[in-house]
């Protein structure tokens, strides 16, 4: 009878182990393991009839196909062999033990116990069938093992051979070198490569295999497992395969594909090739006068470009336009794409114009092309030249008027300041005992006119201010308060404001400048109890045009000290110029200013304590802060009055020559102006430099409206 | 002609808020102040603050300063005035006016738990 | 803040007669930069909101009867009606727009 067993290890016995068994007896066992493993046979005890060759008694291990091992006797001899030590392994998962004994024994035998177990197959050392082992790398687990590959590669569906993806190679250079994959190492089994080599229409492939030519073939039938196919437009060409490269091919189209085929098996080492595209020849370009073309070659065919460029100081021009360089291209049909143009030397074309400034022509009839030079100047005595530089500009190669400092950059005309055009007289005579300035004495002098509509009688009220640049206007921060209360600072909005520039008699206005405000500026800590921080600017809405009765002051440099005791400034305005007049007698001369022509007087610095002391003196609560210096006589006599306010007190300065704002009519009294011992008091502009310049955006020609020591 | 136009009578519990306002017409409203006055009987007129609605910017009598918040909406040329914390000391007649020219219709303000 | 001071705080006079009203204030209202007096006279008839009479001190608002003049300067102003009118039945109050805004007492028009 037969016994199929189907467990990974078990025991065999002879029939009545471990009596003797019985006589005319026949049992197999079928032992069958998982795929993957092998079954190992051994014998604990053996003992069976001896015969010549086992023809009695015997155990045949066995698979489907082969007989393993037949054993007899006890032990071995020339004509039989026991197991003794030996060890049976199937070599597959399958393993017959086939026990037979004969029909007689002549004394007892005890039969056999054997013992097998499932043991894993190691495939990978034990697989030499190039179909069956893994292309790359195996690796074996029990029961079973897999393939797998290296970098770049990928397994096969047939999970064994590997294979690389590369069917998106396209090639669109005109020059080239294409591979079979990993050349000249053997090529990738079970692989399908597509290689596309793509050109612009006109140009036609040429192919060249190189020396190595290696690819699986056979003897009789052409190209079975491995090739080389190409198709050029309706042709296809190939396969080849074998040792022997094909000769040159001239496709005679600018589109090639390229098939390149690996069966599952093989080491071939594949294949190389050079393309290359040819196309219709041109012919040589001329050269143009005062040009170059680069590169310069023997011949020129489709698709090759070349760059026609002028010498130094010249440009190419191609239908009336200029440029650097220009490029021309090999057509299909054998032709350049473009005429060859001509090198047109370099025109800088009309200089721009300078604002407030002149160009002059160096170069005779006013020439403007390559190395011809102008100069520009800034209009004087007005404006000057930013960095103080010569102004000479040179036409350069590139056709662009270049400055050896500047550059490419135009000049720039900074407003001259504290420069009148009429000098102020040395002596004045006893606004307050002053007298009527000339036009032009005070150029910087601007009249403020503010009309605050947004409350209900409109009000109306002038001051004075001081141009510091063509946009801005320095005045006091109380000129631009509105008036209705007293205890509080609200800006009047920029609308109710307008500036006059250039102003000498009020009654005659048509010869002044007058301009709107963009932006009215209070000192942010202005303080209406005490009038600290009494400053503030006007941007003007365009900038102002500057001539001899319309000029800027200086700024003074930043220091502290502010102007030194007893040195003389000036002063204007357009405030009370009559010592008898009260403020109470002149109210009913209703808004206009309270002088017609424009007033100055000449003022000396008073020592801080001293106006300080005056002050403090008062019944009032004055309060003279370092921020404020005083002006005036102790006699009194002179001085600035009601409507003079933030008008500049103006100092020389000596090493410039310049007129520096130092000052800003502030306040004064209570009594009249021009009182003995009441000096005026002026904001201390040294103070807010720094401030000024953050509002008005610090300049590049800083120093240009700023007197520095 | 101009005209200030007065939201209606309000009776508002202690501690609560309200908001008046004060419909500008025949002007441009965003350019000219509009000033707020509060009338108790026998205790005359009293200056609360004003606003430009143009720019926002605003003035307040320091005693009311708290009490009283000035907005206005240039689109629809109002201006409102908010009285929070509300007592019985704020019962009163409450006027707009133009600067110091136009006065409002008023807006009567009785505070009662 | 500057006080206001109205007097008298009432009068009655007869239709026809002439009416002078006092308003002082505690400091000046003269504002040197604008020549202006910062003073207005308002009317405030019963339920009724106040109207504009005089601004800057003396200036007639527009509308307004020539029998209503304002005089003053500094400190001291004065309201005078010519010929009181029956429709002139009225409390009369002065502000001061100098500063931050106040107003006299007012001063109560009867008539006989």
């Known amino acids: 009878h037969t016994v199929e067993l189907n467990n990974m290890f078990g025991q065999i016995q002879s029939p009545g182990y471990p009596d003797s068994y019985p006589s005319d007896s026949e049992v197999t066992w079928n032992i069958t393991v998982p795929e993957g493993f092998r079954i190992k046979l051994y014998f604990m005890h053996f003992n069976l009839e001896s015969s010549y060759l086992c023809e009695y008694d015997y155990v045949k291990v066995e698979t489907e196909e082969q007989v393993l091992a037949t054993f007899c006797g006890r032990e071995t001899t020339d004509t039989e062999q026991t197991p003794g030590q030996e060890v049976v392994f199937s070599p597959g998962s399958f393993m017959s033990i086939t026990f037979r004994s004969d029909f007689s024994n002549e004394e007892r035998f005890t039969g056999f116990d054997a013992h097998y177990m499932a043991v894993d197959v190691d495939e990978c050392t034990e697989r030499e069938d190039e179909e069956l082992s893994c292309d790359h790398y195996c690796h074996n687990y029990i029961g079973g093992y897999y393939c797998s590959c290296r970098f770049g590669y990928l397994l096969h569906t047939d999970n064994r051979t590997c294979r690389v993806e590369c069917s998106d190679n396209v090639y669109t250079q005109r020059t080239g070198v294409i591979t079979s994959p990993d050349f000249p190492n053997p090529y990738p089994k079970s692989s399908e490569c597509f290689y596309t080599i793509e050109l612009e229409e006109g140009f036609m492939v040429s192919l060249q295999f190189e020396d190595i030519f290696d690819i699986e073939d056979h003897p009789e039938v052409p190209c079975p497992y491995d090739y080389i196919k190409i198709k050029a437009g309706p042709k296809v060409l190939g396969p080849f395969c074998g040792e022997k490269a094909p000769e040159p091919i001239n496709t005679e189209s600018h589109s090639v594909q390229i098939l390149f085929r690996s069966d599952n098996s093989g080491e071939n080492q594949g294949w190389r090739l050079s393309y290359r595209a040819t196309g219709n020849e041109c012919p040589d370009p001329e050269l143009p006068v005062h040009g170059k073309i680069e590169p310069l070659q023997a011949t020129y065919s489709f698709k090759d470009q070349v760059l026609i460029s002028c010498d130094t100081g010249y440009k190419v021009l191609k239908d009336n336009v200029e440029m650097d360089t220009f490029q021309i291209e090999c057509l299909k049909d054998g032709t350049w794409s473009n005429r060859i143009p001509t090198c047109k030397i370099a025109d800088c074309g009309a200089p721009a114009e300078l604002k407030h400034g002149l160009i002059t022509f160096s170069t005779r009839n006013n020439l403007t092309t390559y190395k011809s030079e102008i100069q520009y100047s800034c209009q004087q005595p007005y404006y000057k030249m930013l960095h103080n530089i010569t102004g000479v500009y040179t036409c350069s190669a590139q056709g662009v008027w270049m400055n050896e400092v500047l550059g490419r950059s135009q000049p720039t005309c900074l407003p001259v300041c504290g420069q009148p055009s009429r000098s102020l007289p040395n002596l004045v005579k006893r606004i307050i005992g002053g007298r009527n300035a000339e036009p032009g004495l005070f150029p910087w002098q601007a009249l403020i006119v503010v009309e605050d509509t947004s409350r209900v009688p409109n009000d109306k009220w002038f001051g004075s201010g001081a141009l510091l640049s063509e946009s801005w206007i320095l005045t006091a921060a109380h000129v631009l308060r509105s008036q209705r209360r007293d205890n509080t600072v609200t800006p009047v909005s920029k609308e109710h404001v307008t500036v006059y520039l250039g102003l000498h008699d009020v009654r005659d206005k048509s010869g002044a400048v007058n301009s709107s405000a963009a932006q009215v500026v209070l000192h942010p800590d202005f303080n209406i109890q005490n009038y600290n921080h009494d400053i503030a600017l006007v941007q003007l809405r365009e900038p102002v045009p500057l001539g001899p009765h319309v000029m800027p002051i200086c700024l003074p440099s930043p220091e502290p000290e502010g102007p030194e005791p007893h040195m003389l400034g000036l002063v204007a305005g357009w405030g009370i110029s009559n010592p008898n007049v009260t403020v109470d007698e002149i109210i009913s001369s209703g808004t206009r200013t309270l002088s017609d022509v424009l007033q100055y007087v000449k003022l000396p610095v008073v020592p801080y304590a001293e106006c300080k002391t005056s002050y403090e003196s008062r019944s009032g609560n004055y309060s003279v802060t370092e921020n404020m210096f005083c002006a005036g006589y102790y006699e009194g006599g002179k001085d600035t009055c009601l409507g003079d306010s933030g008008g500049a007190f103006v100092i020389l300065d000596d090493l410039s020559q310049r007129w520096v704002a130092q000052g800003l009519v502030s306040w004064g009294g209570p009594e009249e102006c021009g009182s003995k011992q009441v000096y005026g008091v002026y904001t201390k502009v040294s103070n807010y430099v720094d401030w000024l310049w953050e509002q008005m955006g610090s300049p590049q020609g800083l120093g240009d409206l700023q007197v520095e020591r | 002609q101009v005209q200030l136009k007065q939201s209606g009578a309000e009776l508002m519990k202690p501690g609560a808020s309200v908001k008046l306002s004060c419909k500008a017409t025949g002007y441009t409203f965003t350019g000219k102040w509009i000033e707020w006055v509060k009338q108790r009987p026998g205790h005359g007129l009293e200056w609360i603050g004003e606003i430009l609605p143009g720019t926002g910017s605003t003035n307040y009598n320091e005693k009311f300063k708290g009490k009283a918040t000035f907005t206005a909406d240039s689109s629809s040329n109002t201006a409102y005035m908010q009285l929070s914390s509300l007592t019985t000391e704020d019962s009163a007649m409450y006027y707009c006016?133009?600067?110091?020219?136009?006065w409002g219709t008023g807006t009567t303000v009785t505070v009662s738990s | 803040d500057i006080v206001m001071t109205q007097s008298p705080s009432s009068l009655a006079v007869s239709a026809g007669e002439k009416v002078t009203m006092s308003c002082k204030s505690s400091?000046?209202?003269?504002?040197?930069?604008?020549?202006?007096?910062?003073l207005a006279w308002y009317q405030q008839k019963p339920g009724q909101s106040p109207k504009l009479l005089i601004y800057?001190?003396?200036t007639r608002e527009s509308g307004v009867p020539d029998r209503f003049t304002g005089s003053g300067s500094g400190t001291d102003f004065t309201l005078t009606i010519s010929s009181v009118q029956a429709e002139d039945l009225a409390v009369y109050y002065c502000?001061?727009?100098?500063?931050?805004?106040?107003f006299g007492g007012g001063t109560k028009l009867e008539i006989k």
């Open positions: 502000k001061q727009s100098y500063n931050i805004p106040t």
């Open positions: 800057w001190a003396s």
């Open positions: 006016l133009r600067s110091e020219d136009v």
């Open positions: 400091q000046s209202l003269l504002n040197s930069r604008t020549r202006k007096n910062y």
